[in-house]
C-alpha cells in the first residue's frame, strides 16, 4: 500500500465522469430512437 491514496486522483475522476456522460448520451439516444420507432 505504498501509494494507495494516489489512485483516487482528479484526472482519473474526470475521465470517469466523461465516460459516464458519454454513456448517458449514447443510451439516451438509443432510448429516444426506440420510442420514435414504436
Amino acid at each position: 500500500h505504498s501509494d494507495g491514496i494516489f489512485t483516487d486522483s482528479y484526472s482519473r475522476y474526470r475521465k470517469q465522469m466523461a465516460v459516464k456522460k458519454y454513456l448517458a448520451a449514447v443510451l439516451g439516444k438509443r432510448y429516444k430512437q426506440r420510442v420514435k420507432n414504436k
Epitope: H1, S2, D3, I5, F6, T7, S9, Y10, Y13
Partner: antibody, heavy 112, light 110 residues
C-alpha cells in the same frame, strides 16, 4: 456530493463520532480525508482512508482520531478524547492528496 | 510529517493586478507534482482550483496559474477581480500516504 454530520457541543474527554455521507460515487473507488479548521485558523489535515480501507494519519492525530468505513457510502471520524483545542469545523473531502469534492463541514465545540 | 510554508501570509493588490503566492515543501511531493491549490471564502468550504501543480480544475478561469515541481510551487492570479479576494491554501500529497496544508495566504483586492 459529500456531507458531514454529528458535530455538536461536547465536554472535554467525551468521545464524539462524526459521519461523512457520500452520494454519486462509491467508497470502494474513493479515498476520503478528514480536514479541520479551528475558528479563524488554517486548514489542518487529520487523516485519510483509501479505497481498500487502509488508514493513514498525521502524526499528531494518530492517538486522538480513528477513521473507519461504516458502509459503502459512509466514513466515520471518531474523536477519542476531545480537548478544547479540538474545537473546529470538520470537513470531509474526496481525493488522494488532492481534495476535489468537499462537504460543507460540521462544527464541533469542546467546552466545559 | 512534511511541512508546507506559504508566503506571504497576506497580500494586497488592485483590481486588474497580479498576485503571486509561494508554497515551499520540506520534502518532495509525490511524483514531484502532487501539489494542489484551494480558494476559501469566509463561512465556505475550500474550492478546488489547481491539481498536480499546474492543471486547472473544471470551471476555474485561466487567470489562475500554477507552476513548480518537487518542493517549490507558485500560484499566480492575474487580471485580479473583486471576487478573487479570499484565502488561498496549497496542499501536498507525499509518499507514505500523508498529506498536509500550507498556512494560507489572504488575498485582499483593492
Amino acid at each position: 456530493s459529500v456531507e458531514e454530520s454529528g458535530g455538536r457541543l461536547v465536554t472535554p474527554g467525551t468521545p464524539l463520532t462524526l459521519t461523512c455521507t457520500v452520494s454519486g460515487f462509491s467508497l470502494s473507488s474513493a479515498a476520503m480525508s478528514w480536514v479541520r479548521q479551528a475558528p479563524g485558523k488554517g486548514l489542518e489535515w487529520i487523516g485519510i482512508i483509501d479505497d481498500s480501507g487502509n488508514t493513514y494519519y498525521a502524526s499528531w492525530a494518530k492517538a486522538r482520531f480513528t477513521i473507519s468505513k461504516t458502509s459503502s457510502t459512509t466514513v466515520d471520524l471518531k474523536m477519542t478524547s476531545p480537548t478544547t483545542e479540538d474545537t473546529a469545523t470538520y470537513f470531509c473531502a474526496r481525493g488522494g492528496g488532492e481534495f476535489f469534492i468537499w462537504g460543507p463541514g460540521t462544527l464541533v465545540t469542546v467546552s466545559s | 510529517d512534511p511541512v508546507l510554508t506559504q508566503t506571504p501570509s497576506s497580500v494586497s493588490a488592485a483590481v486588474g493586478g497580479t498576485v503571486t503566492i509561494n508554497c515551499q515543501s520540506s520534502q518532495s511531493v509525490y511524483n514531484n507534482k502532487w501539489l494542489s491549490w484551494y480558494q476559501q471564502k469566509p463561512g465556505q468550504s475550500p474550492k478546488f482550483l489547481i491539481y498536480q501543480a499546474s492543471n486547472l480544475a473544471s470551471g476555474v478561469p485561466s487567470r489562475f496559474k500554477g507552476s513548480g515541481s518537487g518542493t517549490q510551487f507558485t500560484l499566480t492570479i492575474s487580471d485580479l477581480e473583486c471576487d478573487d479576494g479570499a484565502t488561498y491554501y496549497c496542499a501536498g500529497g507525499y509518499r507514505g500516504n500523508v498529506c498536509g496544508f500550507g498556512g494560507g495566504t489572504e488575498v485582499v483586492v483593492k
